[in-house]
């Protein structure tokens, strides 16, 4: 972004923001917006949240275009009400490890997070959580009955993993990765971060790469079939190109996405790989940018639900799938 | 009545100081840019300087800079031009102009101050 | 610098005639965001200047509709449809897309 010319603003008045969010200066001391918060998309037009002590961080140069609101090194993380250290690992509960890493918290499921597709010997898998047991099983008993306003989007559920051995010991080093989060946007673009140590140096860093659960645009539940209540993983008629922050992906794509359910399941992605898409500037500049490609999606009740405070924010915020 | 005083213009020898101040009423002062802009006698307008909401960014004419300085104080809903090192040809009547930020510029004008640069 | 042309520099109108001011801008005035930050003010004998025009063809709240503006790239222009008295004075286009921002030399419109 070239600050040099006048300032010009849109033509509507200051947004307003939502509660905690502060209203700030632009990148180039132009105009008003509302700031990025952590795991953000930032440009220099939109940057982060300077009260809450996040940058923007473009990863490499090359690509001073579009980065992610990063907390600044060694910021600390407020985890259900309590402060951990950056660099602290804690058991959230029974059933995550988890690691506060400059502001960002990266955790790891101690329980399976396998997804079940429904068989003809249990139509209607659901995990539940048993008494005395911290980590929930599979039951196939009947659904109840669900009344559902719409189809039920979500991006936010756990996938299969790929990539290293969460486990795997090199060098002195014992290798550890986060799971990648869930999507930040059930549609359009948005990010997913995770935490690794999987470097030269076994320093913890953070890794983000961009995600698209489903484009916005598309009507999904138009494309169910009849007397279907889903639709999986919806044929894209044609290539497209991604869009980001005015950027436009230099290849056209043949991308998987997920669909919808209009029975109250949700449709995430189940497996899913991680490749360098590069993307060209109206300016001619080009950057790279990692992104999440779907391979495969799965439609499923194990729904994010808010009895539980860690796992709503685990399968709404940070964490999701490993590619 | 949304409106814009001008004060501070005279008569300054070459080589002089000034500082122009505007004052602002009837509006939000925070929420508009500020301008200042000049008419020497007899010719046209030309455009001296502007400054954001907050005073943290401001533009002014390349010739102009190291000689102006523009600033604004929010709490007194004011903005200045301090002008050092004057010359006989910063002579003019000196506006002061409320600039939207984002549809048009320049909506609200003050009734401008002289300055004159004479030995 | 962006230089601001205007033709004629001075025009003599009779009441209910049309005015037409020409303003040439010596390299396109589209800013980095895509819109044309042309505008065009006058100045009546002994007052400040007021907006009339903004963003080529917007008029300021108060304007008359017989005042309209229009052009694109490098060449607009402010028509009067039906001169009236009061409308005269100095008018003024200005460019706000590029540093420095820069006005026109004037057109002086003078009433037959």
């Known amino acids: 972004q070239n600050c040099s010319g006048p300032c010009r603003c849109p033509d509507e008045p200051a947004p307003r923001c939502p509660a905690g969010v502060s209203l700030v200066l632009d990148g180039c001391g132009c105009c008003r917006v509302c700031a990025k918060q952590l795991g953000e998309l930032c440009t220099e037009r939109d940057p982060c949240d300077p009260h809450k002590g996040l940058f923007c961080d473009f990863g490499s140069p090359a690509n001073r275009k579009i980065g992610v609101c990063t907390a600044k090194d060694g910021a600390p993380c407020i985890f259900g009400g309590t402060v951990y250290r950056s660099g602290e690992s804690f058991q959230s509960s029974c059933k995550y490890q988890c690691t506060c890493l400059d502001g960002a918290v990266g955790c790891m499921p101690l329980c399976s997070m396998d997804v079940r597709l429904p068989s003809p010997d249990c139509p209607f898998p659901r995990r539940v959580k048993l008494p005395g047991k911290c980590c929930e099983e599979w039951v196939c008993d009947e659904p109840k009955d669900q009344t559902v306003v719409g189809p039920a989007l979500a991006a936010y559920r756990l996938e299969d993993t790929f990539g290293p051995d969460p486990t795997m010991i090199r060098a002195n080093c014992l290798v550890q990765t986060t799971e990648w989060s869930a999507c930040s946007k059930t549609c359009g673009m948005g990010i997913s971060t995770r935490v690794t140590n999987d470097n030269a140096s076994c320093r913890l860093e953070k890794q983000s790469r961009l995600c698209m659960v489903r484009p916005c645009e598309a009507d999904l539940e138009e494309n169910i079939k009849k007397g279907k209540k889903c639709i999986r993983t919806p044929k894209i008629s044609k290539p497209i190109k991604f869009e980001l922050s005015g950027c436009t992906s230099m290849k056209t794509y043949r991308a998987k996405f997920c669909g919808v359910c209009t029975d109250g399941r949700c449709c995430t992605p189940h497996r899913t790989t991680t490749l360098p898409v590069e993307f060209k500037c109206p300016d001619g500049e080009v950057m790279k940018k990692n992104m999440m490609f779907i391979k495969t999606c799965a439609c499923h009740y194990n729904c994010p639900g808010d009895n539980d405070i860690f796992e709503s924010l685990y399968y709404r915020k940070m964490y999701g799938d490993m590619a | 009545e949304v409106q814009l005083v001008e004060s501070g213009g005279g008569l300054v020898q070459p080589g002089g100081s000034l500082r122009l101040s505007c004052a602002a009423s009837?509006?939000?002062?925070?929420?508009?840019?500020m301008a200042w802009v000049r008419q020497a006698p007899g010719k046209g307008l030309e455009w001296v300087a502007n400054?954001?909401?907050?005073?943290?960014?401001?533009d002014l004419l390349a010739s102009l800079k190291s000689r102006f300085t523009i600033s604004r104080d929010n709490a007194k809903n004011s903005v200045y031009l301090q002008m050092n090192s004057l010359r006989a040809e910063d002579t003019a009547v000196y506006y002061c102009?409320?600039?939207?930020?984002?549809?048009?510029?320049?909506?609200?004008w003050g009734a401008g101050t002289t300055v004159t640069v004479s030995s | 610098d962006i230089v601001m042309t205007q033709t004629p520099l001075s025009l003599s109108v009779s009441l209910g005639d049309q005015a037409s001011i020409s303003c040439k801008s010596s390299?396109?005035?589209?800013?980095?965001?895509?819109?044309?930050?042309l505008e065009w003010y006058l100045q009546k004998p002994g007052q400040s200047p007021q907006l009339l025009i903004y963003?080529?063809?917007s008029r300021a709240s108060g304007v008359p509709d017989r005042f309209s503006g229009s052009g694109s790239g490098t060449d607009f222009t402010l028509k009067i449809s039906r001169v009236e008295a009061e409308d005269l004075g100095v008018y003024y286009c200005?460019?706000?897309?590029?540093?420095?921002?820069?006005f026109g030399q004037g057109t002086k419109l003078e009433i037959k």
């Open positions: 390299q396109s005035i589209v800013h980095y965001n895509e819109k044309t930050y």
């Open positions: 963003k080529v063809s």
């Open positions: 200005f460019q706000g897309s590029h540093f420095p921002l820069t």
């Open positions: 102009a409320r600039d939207t930020s984002r549809g048009s510029y320049f909506d609200v």
């Open positions: 400054i954001n909401y907050y005073g943290s960014r401001t």
């Open positions: 009837g509006f939000t002062f925070s929420d508009y840019y």
